[in-house]
C-alpha cells in the first residue's frame, strides 16, 4: 500500500519534478551531478527531499519516540501503547512489564 511504501521510503514522495529521482535516503546534487546521502547534510543544509529523512533520523535518537510518516512528526510511544506501531513495540512491551506500572500491593 501507499503507507507501506512511505514507511520504507520516507522521503520518496517528496521528490520534485525539477530533480532527478534518487534512491531512498538520498538527494540529487546538481553540482556533483549525482545522488548523495541525506545523512551528509542533515546538520547543516536545508534540502527538501531530505526533510522527512533528517527529522526521522533525529527522532530515532530520542528514547520512546518514533517518526510518524503520515504526520511527518516525532511522536511519543507512551501516548499510543496498546495500538502502537512496530517502532514502539520495544518501548510499550517494556512499559507493560515494568513493575512501576503495577498497582501498589495493599
Amino acid at each position: 500500500s501507499r503507507v507501506d511504501q512511505e514507511e520504507r521510503f520516507p522521503q520518496g514522495l517528496w521528490t520534485g519534478v525539477a530533480m532527478r529521482s534518487c534512491p531512498e535516503e538520498q538527494y540529487w546534487d546538481p553540482l556533483l551531478g549525482t545522488c548523495m546521502s541525506c545523512k551528509t547534510i542533515c546538520n547543516h543544509q536545508s534540502q527538501r527531499t531530505c526533510a522527512a529523512f533528517c527529522r526521522s533520523l533525529s527522532c530515532r535518537k530520542e528514547q520512546g519516540k518514533f517518526y510518524d510518516h503520515l504526520l511527518r512528526d516525532c511522536i511519543s510511544c507512551a501516548s499510543i501503547c496498546g495500538q502502537h506501531p512496530k517502532q514502539c513495540a520495544y518501548f510499550c512491551e517494556n512499559k507493560l512489564r515494568s513493575p512501576v506500572n503495577l498497582p501498589p500491593e495493599l
Epitope: V3, E6, A51, L70, I75
Partner: antibody, heavy 118, light 107 residues
Framework: EVQLQQSGPELVKPGASVKISCKTS????????MHWVKQSHGKSLEWIGG????????SNNQKFKGKATLTVDKSSSTAYMDFRSLTSEDSAVYYC???????????WGQGTLVTVSA | DIVMTQSHKFMSTSVGDRVSITCKAS??????VAWYQQKPGQSPKLLIY???TRHTGVPDRFTGSGSGTDYTLTITSVQAEDLTLYYC?????????FGGGTKLEIK
Amino acid sequence: EVQLQQSGPELVKPGASVKISCKTSGYTFTEYAMHWVKQSHGKSLEWIGGINPNHGGTSNNQKFKGKATLTVDKSSSTAYMDFRSLTSEDSAVYYCARWGTDPFFAYWGQGTLVTVSA
Amino acid sequence: DIVMTQSHKFMSTSVGDRVSITCKASQDVSTAVAWYQQKPGQSPKLLIYWASTRHTGVPDRFTGSGSGTDYTLTITSVQAEDLTLYYCHQHYAPPWTFGGGTKLEIK
C-alpha cells in the same frame, strides 16, 4: 470523490466543551492523517494538530496542547476534535483538513462555526 | 516555529492585470510552500504546492515561484473571481504555519 463532512454550528457557554466531527468518504481513512485548523473571524489560519488514524498518535501545535483532543473512529471513518474550557477567544470556524501524499492541505471540510457566548 | 509573513494585507489590482503576492519565511523552507485561495464563506482551496506545482484543476494564470525564504504567487491576468483572499503556508516542518493573508481588491 474525497469528501469531508463536518458537524453543524455550535453555540456554547464559556467554560464548556464542544466536540466537532468530520465524517470522511471517497478514500481509505487509515492511509492519510487528518488535521484541524482554526480560523478566527477576519483572521488567518492556525494549525491545531493532526492525528494518524491507524494508532491515534497525534502531532500538536503547543499552543493548543491541553485545549484540543483529537480522536478517530475507524469504523465510521470519522475524525473528532474535542475543545475544552472554552472562552471567547475560541469563537472561530474550525476546519478538518486532509493532506495528500505530501504535507499540504488538498482537501478541507466545509468548516464548523463555534460561538462561545454567555 | 517558522513564521510566514505576507507583508501586504491588501493589494489593489484591475481585471486583466498581472499581480504578485509575496510571502517571506523566517528560515529557509526549501520550496516547501503552498498557496491557498479563500472566498468569503468558503473553505480554503489549494492552488500551488512545492512553491511552483499547480494543483489539479487550477487555471494556468496562477503561477508560484521562489526558493529559500522568499516566495511569490503570481496571477498573470486577474479575473473578477480572483479578487479574494490568499494565504501562503509552509509545509517544511511542524508546527505547520500560515501567512497572515493578502486580500486582492479592485483598484
